[in-house]
Structure formats: structure tokens, C-alpha cells
């Protein structure tokens, strides 16, 4: 099954994670060649027996495809030709997991590298004062997390202190049976302070952040993927 | 030009086992895949699985689910068929197939009979 | 599974004269993005393994005579020998690689008048 005659050429991949529902990008660079028509892209996942996405004369060739990626990858083919064998994929799935192959070939030689890829979902989380609650409460919002998150409390005053005894936090299945809605209730807030809600799972880290003065509040929130240089 | 050359015929023992070999020659590569199908004397063709040698991976039909085991040896460019358990119903010319648009190229049979 | 049936069984055509193969499949064989249908027909001769003739359900493969074509879409195909000749004698198989399990139909043998 091996192409005789032709040398190695290098080919980089990176480990990502993608957003269920949303689409994701597998990322995959290689050493560029002078002309579209002689490059082949082939993406292929272990435990799949079809391919996942193959492009080669300089467009997609979607007749060897796997079933269960049909109608939902693309390549970036303006930048082919500079190296870039980047897949996008759409609506990704839960089973999209695993471990892909980007297998290129040139006129220059043929290369190959795998990568990982998770897949889960994350969302940033938004703090807000509750002013219906009958003390100082804040509320920290996360419309999508899979698999459940740990969510905890930090404040700037008071580093290091444990906020488990006076929050509380659950989840709620979404209408899609899969992703979870994340609430966390944090009591006894003092004002002029500033308050951390970090929501975290294997494939995420979320901080929303909120800064409770008399006059104002200001709000931030990032949200950072794990295990990935994406 | 790709061609698939299977190994020889072969006789077994009811509920023994048989090994089939597919070597590819040619200029072909790994991500195509490798499928094997069976046509016992006189009958149709049936489809027993396939694999894509690059990561091994492998797909079986639900009739030979738990008998049949399919591989492939990028080094030496083989895929294998191995059937255990085999019945006399087993004895049949079996083919190993490229996939490609259909399966357009075909190695030339091995016939594999069961008989006590 | 998607189930493929062949008809005829069998078929007897004078040489020069048309024969004509038909398959349906239980499920339509149209991938629409690609607008392509995948459906194949092989020729198979006795103590050979079987030919890749028509892929696409219409593609000729290489090297087959112009005189098989193949039609037809969704769950609805023939393979048409416009005009048979001696080396034609043989059985015909249609398959579908739209999904696996990859299915075959039952053959359809040729033969002479």
C-alpha cells in the first residue's frame, strides 16, 4: 500500500478541541508545493473505514468519503497551495473524538501526522448581581458544558479561601440531551470586591470575572481550551 | 498498474481456521481500502468487511461479526482475511478487492474448502 | 442494510441484439452534494473474479467497450449492452458502496440465443 520512489516530507499537526454544535477546524500544515494539481490531502480517522476528506487536482473528492462525515468538511483550498491542509468541520459531533491523520502527497514526497481531537462543549460564563435573593448573592450563567464541569469560587480579597460552603451550583440538561447548562449561586458577597467564577472541564477553563464597587460593576469573562496550542 | 496477488487454495477441518494473504504491487498507497468478498460455488457475491491499512481500521459485515478478522501489513503492502470456526456453508472462492469508485481492481480468488 | 434485486435471473440475446439489466436498491444511491450515485456493475466470467464495468452508475471503468452504459438514478438502474457479443456471456452483478455493509444483487446471467 506504499508509494515507491518518493521522499519524506514534513507535515505538522495540532491537538484541538471542538465545540458540539459549532464547527471546528483539524489543523495541518505541510511543506508547500508549486503546483495545486499535484497535491493529494486525505484526512482519515482511526476507527472509521471511509475517508474523511480528500482533495486532490485541486478539489474536494468527496466520492470515497465516509457516511458519517458527508455534507460536513471542507478544506481551505485558496490555501492549499501555501501549505495549509487545514479541515473545517461543521456541527460537530460528540463521536467526532479521536485520532485523525493528515496524509499529504506532493511532487516532492509524501508525509504524514496525527492528531487528537476532542470534542465537548464550553461557553463562556456571564456574573451577575441577583438582586431578588434576600442577601448579597452573585449568579454565574453557562449555557453549555459537556462533559460537567467543576465550577468554582475565588475572590480577590479573601485568596485562597473556600467558597463551597456558601454556593451552589447545578446543572441542567439542554433540550439536546447532551450539553448541560451551568449554574453557580455564590452567597454573602461583599461589596468592593472582585469575584471569580471558574468553570472547568478536560477539554475547557472559563473564568467570568466581576468587580462589585457602590458606584459600579464591571464584568469579564475568557475562556481558555486545555491540551491544545490553538 | 495495481494488482492483487492472493495466496493458494486451501483445504480445512470443520471449526478450524483459514488465513488468506492479499499482496499489492504497484503504485498504489495506504489509504485506499482493502475489502473481501466471498462467492460460494454457484451463488452471488457477499461482502465480508474491509479495512483502511493506514490505521488498521476495519469494518465487518454483521453475518461474519466475531469470526472474521481483517489486517494489513503497511511493511510488506498485505492484507490478511483470517475465518475461524469454518462450516462446511464456508467453502467458497474468497476475493480481496480495492476499493476505488466501486472496487476496481480485484486479486484472482482463493478457494477455501471445509470438509471433514 | 440496503437490499439490491436484480431482474432477470437470466437472460438469452441474439448476438449483435440489445440486453438490458435492471437493479433497484431499497434506498436511493443519489448523494446529492456530489451528484453522484453509487452504484456499480461488474462482469463476471467462470474461474474469474469479477470486473469493475460502470461505477457512478453511468462511468464507463477502464478499458470496459463503449457498447456498456449504464443508467439510471436514486433506486432505479440499468446496465445496457447495446449490441452483444460472444465474449459477453457472463453474469452481471449491480452493488451499492453508498454505505456498509457494501451490498450486492443476486446476478443476472447472459447468454446467447
Known amino acids: 500500500f506504499g508509494i515507491s520512489g518518493r521522499h519524506s516530507i514534513t507535515v505538522t499537526t495540532v491537538a484541538s478541541a471542538g465545540n458540539i454544535g459549532e464547527d471546528g477546524i483539524l489543523s495541518c500544515t505541510f511543506e508547500p508545493d508549486i503546483k495545486l494539481s499535484d497535491i493529494v490531502i486525505q484526512w482519515l480517522k482511526e476507527g472509521v473505514l471511509g475517508l474523511v476528506h480528500e482533495f486532490k487536482e485541486g478539489k474536494d473528492e468527496l466520492s470515497e468519503q465516509d457516511e458519517m462525515f458527508r455534507g460536513r468538511t471542507a478544506v481551505f483550498a485558496d490555501q492549499v497551495i501555501v501549505g495549509n491542509a487545514s479541515l473545517r468541520l461543521k456541527n460537530v459531533q460528540l463521536t467526532d473524538a479521536g485520532t485523525y491523520k493528515c496524509y499529504i502527497i506532493t511532487s516532492k514526497g509524501k508525509g504524514n501526522a496525527n492528531l487528537e481531537y476532542k470534542t465537548g462543549a464550553f461557553s463562556m460564563p456571564e456574573v451577575n448581581v441577583d438582586y431578588n435573593a434576600s442577601s448579597e448573592t452573585l449568579r454565574c450563567e453557562a449555557p453549555r458544558w459537556f462533559p460537567q464541569p467543576t465550577v468554582v469560587w475565588a475572590s480577590q480579597v479573601d485568596q485562597g479561601a473556600n467558597f463551597s460552603e456558601v454556593s451552589n451550583t447545578s446543572f441542567e440538561l439542554n433540550s439536546e440531551n447532551v450539553t448541560m447548562k451551568v449554574v453557580s449561586v455564590l452567597y454573602n458577597v461583599t461589596i468592593n470586591n472582585t469575584y471569580s467564577c471558574m468553570i472547568e472541564n478536560d477539554i475547557a477553563k472559563a473564568t467570568g470575572d466581576i468587580k462589585v464597587t457602590e458606584s459600579e460593576i464591571k464584568r469579564r469573562s475568557h475562556l481558555q481550551l486545555l491540551n491544545s496550542k490553538a | 498498474q495495481v494488482q492483487l496477488v492472493q495466496s493458494g487454495a486451501e483445504v480445512k477441518k470443520p471449526g478450524s481456521s483459514v488465513k488468506v494473504s492479499c499482496k499489492a504491487s504497484?503504485?498504489?498507497?495506504?489509504?485506499?481500502?482493502i475489502h473481501w468478498v466471498r462467492q460460494a460455488p454457484g451463488q452471488g457475491l457477499e461482502w465480508m468487511g474491509g479495512i483502511m491499512p493506514i490505521f488498521g481500521t476495519t469494518k465487518y459485515a454483521q453475518n461474519f461479526q466475531g469470526r472474521v478478522t481483517i489486517t494489513a501489513d503497511e511493511s510488506t503492502s498485505t492484507a490478511y482475511m483470517e475465518l475461524s470456526s469454518l462450516r462446511s456453508e464456508d467453502t467458497a472462492v474468497y476475493y480481496c478487492?480495492?476499493?476505488?469508485?466501486?472496487?476496481?481492481?480485484w486479486g484472482q480468488g482463493t478457494t477455501v474448502t471445509v470438509s471433514s | 442494510d440496503i437490499v439490491m434485486t436484480q431482474s432477470p435471473d437470466s437472460l438469452a440475446v441474439s448476438l449483435g441484439e440489445r440486453a438490458t439489466i435492471n437493479c433497484k436498491s431499497s434506498?436511493?444511491?443519489?448523494?446529492?452534494?456530489?451528484?453522484?450515485?453509487?452504484l456499480a456493475w461488474y462482469q463476471q466470467k467462470p474461474g474469474q473474479p469479477p470486473k469493475l464495468l460502470i461505477y457512478?452508475?453511468?462511468t464507463r471503468g477502464s478499458g470496459v467497450p463503449d457498447r456498456f452504459s449504464g443508467s439510471g438514478s436514486g433506486t432505479d438502474f440499468t446496465l445496457t449492452i447495446s449490441s452483444l457479443q460472444a465474449e459477453d456471456v457472463a453474469t452481471y452483478f449491480c452493488q451499492q458502496y453508498y454505505s456498509t455493509p457494501i451490498t450486492f444483487g443476486q446476478g443476472t446471467k447472459v447468454e446467447i440465443k
Open positions: 457512478w452508475a453511468s
Open positions: 478487492a480495492r476499493r476505488n469508485y466501486g472496487m476496481d481492481v
Open positions: 434506498q436511493s444511491l443519489l448523494y446529492r452534494p456530489v451528484n453522484k450515485n453509487f
Open positions: 504497484g503504485d498504489t498507497f495506504t489509504t485506499y481500502q
